[in-house]
């Protein structure tokens, strides 16, 4: 997956830091105070969407072959830049009963991006 460097507008991973204070969660999330969540941004032109390296799945690669040939119903489908690899993160927080919970939360951090 590409890292966004400001030079290309192709689907890439953009760094983004989430501060729990910014969204009002700081009074119940004990740690961390924030984290690099990141997000996906950029274009998914046909020639990119069809390559398995940047594609979300074999399925989207196959569908894209039909889309490029103008086959209905895929002709007007747009390929989107989405997370293809996500990573968990450990969090310490208060649950609904004010008990302290330590949990590895799945899909917290965007590691790589690709075209759907």
């Amino acid at each position: 997956g590409l890292e966004c460097d400001g030079k290309v507008n192709i689907c890439c991973k953009k760094q983004f830091f989430v501060s729990f204070k910014d969204i009002g969660w700081n009074d119940w999330i004990i740690a961390p105070s924030g984290y690099h969540a990141n997000y996906c941004e950029g274009e998914c032109p046909s020639h990119i969407a069809g390559t398995s390296g940047s594609s979300l799945s074999f399925h989207s690669t196959v569908i894209n072959h039909y889309r490029m040939r103008g086959h209905s119903p895929f002709a007007n489908l747009k390929s989107c830049c989405v997370p293809t690899k996500l990573r968990p993160m450990s969090m310490l927080y208060y649950d609904d009963g004010q008990n302290i919970i330590k949990k590895d939360i799945q899909n917290m951090i965007v590691e790589e991006c690709g075209c759907s």
Epitope: I23, G24, W25, N26, D27, W28, M91, Y93, D95, D96, G97, I101, K103, I105, Q106, N107
Partner: antibody, heavy 123, light 108 residues
Framework: QVQLVQSGAEVKKPGASVKVSCKAS????????MHWVRQAPGQGLEWMGV????????NYAQKFQGRVTMTRDTSISTAYMELSRLRSDDTAVYYC????????????????WGQGTLVTVSS | EIVLTQSPGTLSLSPGERATLSCRAS???????LAWYQQKPGQAPRLLIY???SRAGGIPDRFSGSGSGTDFTLTISRLEPEDFAVYYC?????????FGGGTKVEIK
């Protein structure tokens, strides 16, 4: 300590509207969703809808779609529920209740409730 | 929508007895998203149990919750005078949020 303080009792005529307020204190207001639940005399609890104070996004029960509007003023940590075109069967106690609607963490129970606001609809 | 059916509607028991309240869901509810509330006359509901089996802060250990899938139970091991009230189950896994019809625990 966490407190949800609601506005006082209201008496309304059929066809009118009512706006109930719920002032939050003791916690970070935008960090918790605010739900509204009503209870008709001698009846059970009925969920009306929810507002995310951070974004203003709402989700209403189908029964109340088109008649209910939930808003908030984050500057004064207050949520509002307005019900229009009132009928006699809208006579009930209306509660606000906070929750963190975050399924990934197993969160979402209504841990604090307002004291309730009695709305009487009568001609 | 997920329909929650509570039984019995009324439970007549004496102080010191064991109370068993049932909540059945129309479709499977992950046990992480089932709560029980207690309501006394003229008061707002109070959270007793969340995540089907975890007690909320300040709730005595005579209250316990269990169950999974579609069948959940609230048990009060030994009824105290202050436990006579109405109890509601609620699911918070899906919108619309729904409550059971309630079980009234009254003094026999």
């Amino acid at each position: 300590q966490v407190q949800l303080v609601q506005s006082g009792a209201e008496v309304k005529k059929p066809g009118a509207s009512v706006k109930v307020s719920c002032k939050a204190s003791g916690y970070t207001f935008p960090g918790y969703h605010m739900h509204w639940v009503r209870q008709a005399p001698g009846q059970g609890l009925e969920w009306m809808g929810v507002i995310n104070p951070s974004s203003g996004d709402t989700n209403y029960a189908q029964k109340f779609q088109g008649r209910v509007t939930m808003t908030r003023d984050t500057s004064i940590s207050t949520a509002y529920m307005e019900l229009s075109r009132l009928r006699s069967d809208d006579t009930a106690v209306y509660y606000c209740a906070r929750a963190r609607d975050i399924a990934a963490l197993g969160l979402g129970a209504f841990d604090y409730w307002g004291q309730g606001t009695l709305v009487t609809v009568s001609s | 929508e997920i329909v929650l059916t509570q039984s019995p509607g009324t439970l007549s028991l004496s102080p010191g007895e064991r109370a068993t309240l049932s909540c059945r869901a129309s479709q499977s509810v992950s046990s992480s998203y089932l709560a029980w509330y207690q309501q006394k006359p003229g008061q707002a509901p109070r959270l007793l149990i969340y995540g089907a089996s975890s007690r909320a802060g300040g709730i005595p250990d005579r209250f316990s919750g269990s169950g999974s899938g579609t069948d959940f139970t609230l048990t009060i091991s030994r009824l105290e005078p202050e436990d006579f009230a109405v109890y509601y189950c609620q699911q918070y896994v899906a919108y619309p949020r729904t409550f059971g019809g309630g079980t009234k625990v009254e003094i026999k």
